[in-house]
């Protein structure tokens, strides 16, 4: 069997692990003095409950989520993390002027369950 | 707000069966697991097993395993629990609950409670 | 299955007086569930995860303890306080009750 991927928040619209953007400027993210640019920042990232079999992403979130009924304060509920990543280039200092650096884990694509 | 509303008083003969039911509303009926709840004459509370609404998925206490049976039909926001093979010592009063948050280990809303009376 | 001893099974109290009762736990668990409940009705959420108040407790509930030792202190008792409360845990399946204690007012 395996993971069932359900799209539909049984806590209700919005409730659910998903993809939520946060605008945040470098001295939000505590990068002003080693980031040039972008100056600010469309930071995606997965928020949300995980409830049932919601996004879930694999086996053993579908375990996570059984046993976390039987015995739920010790066995917590899957968390919504990032499925996939968007890239992003900084534009950075450097001891000799700036540098394009790509990060690709900096930017949540989609969400699931884990 | 959210409201359990349980079914009334049944009195049935030792061997039957009977099924309770608890109707939820103010709030999402899949998103929380139900569970079943039993009291004996006053005394002392018994977790019988829960159900995921969403899923349908199940977990029982061992000692309600055959014992009890637990149901949902989303369609109307209603949870069930059939009891069969009555004997006198099912007679108790059984409350349906749910956690406060959906993956929540304390149930911050009760039924009122369903009174079943096991006499020949 | 961890069973759940609480004590004293009954109290009594004066109002005013500081009370305590105690729930121990066969084997540790990581936290502690408490309801009230008063004849006829259906049991109350009292304190949650060991120290939390549910939602209309008054400041005057306590809630404390660890591992197998977990106790509801109630600092000076009321007589709306009279009811039997039951500690619960859900570490372990299946999820336990405790006997409850019944505290009575003087």
């Known amino acids: 069997a395996r993971a069932r991927n359900g799209d539909h928040c049984p806590l209700g619209p919005g409730r659910c692990c998903r993809l939520h953007t946060v605008r945040a400027s470098l001295e939000d993210l505590g990068w002003a003095d080693w980031v040039l640019s972008p100056r600010e920042v469309q930071v995606t990232m997965c928020i949300g409950a995980c409830p049932s079999q919601f996004r879930a992403a694999n086996m053993h979130a579908q375990i996570k989520t059984s046993l976390h009924r039987l015995k739920p304060d010790t066995v917590p509920a899957p968390c919504c993390v990032p499925a996939s990543y968007n890239p992003m280039v900084l534009i950075q200092k450097t001891d000799t002027g700036v540098s394009l650096q790509t990060y690709d884990d900096l930017l949540a694509k989609d969400c699931h369950c884990i | 707000e959210v409201q359990l509303q349980q079914s009334g008083p049944e009195l049935e003969k030792p061997g039957a069966s009977v099924k309770i039911s608890c109707k939820a509303s103010?709030?999402?009926?899949?998103?929380?697991?139900m569970n079943w709840v039993k009291q004996s004459n006053g005394k002392s509370l018994e977790w019988i097993g829960n159900i995921d609404p969403y899923y349908g998925g199940t977990s029982y206490n061992q000692k309600f395993k055959g014992k009890a049976t637990l149901t949902v039909d989303k369609s109307s926001s209603t949870a069930y629990m059939q009891l069969k093979s009555l004997t006198s010592e099912d007679s108790a009063v059984y409350y349906c609950?749910?956690?406060?948050?959906?993956?929540?280990?304390?149930?911050?809303?009760w039924g009122q409670g369903t009174l079943v009376t096991v006499s020949a | 299955q961890i069973v759940l001893s609480q004590s004293p099974a009954i109290l009594s109290a004066s109002p005013g007086e500081k009370v305590t009762m105690t729930c121990r736990a066969s084997?540790?668990?990581?936290?502690m569930h408490w309801y009230q409940q008063k004849p006829g009705s259906s049991p109350k959420p009292w304190i949650y995860?060991?120290?939390n108040l549910a939602s209309g407790v008054p400041a005057r509930f306590s809630g404390s303890g660890s591992g197998t030792s977990y106790s509801l202190t109630i600092s000076r008792v009321e007589a709306e306080d009279a009811a039997t409360y039951y500690c619960?845990?859900?570490?372990?399946?299946?999820?336990?009750f405790g006997a409850g204690t019944k505290l009575e007012l003087k």
């Open positions: 084997s540790n668990v990581n936290y």
């Open positions: 995860a060991t120290s």
């Open positions: 103010g709030y999402s009926f899949t998103g929380y697991n």
């Open positions: 619960q845990q859900w570490s372990d399946n299946p999820l336990t």
């Open positions: 609950a749910r956690p406060g948050r959906y993956d929540g280990a304390w149930f911050a809303y």
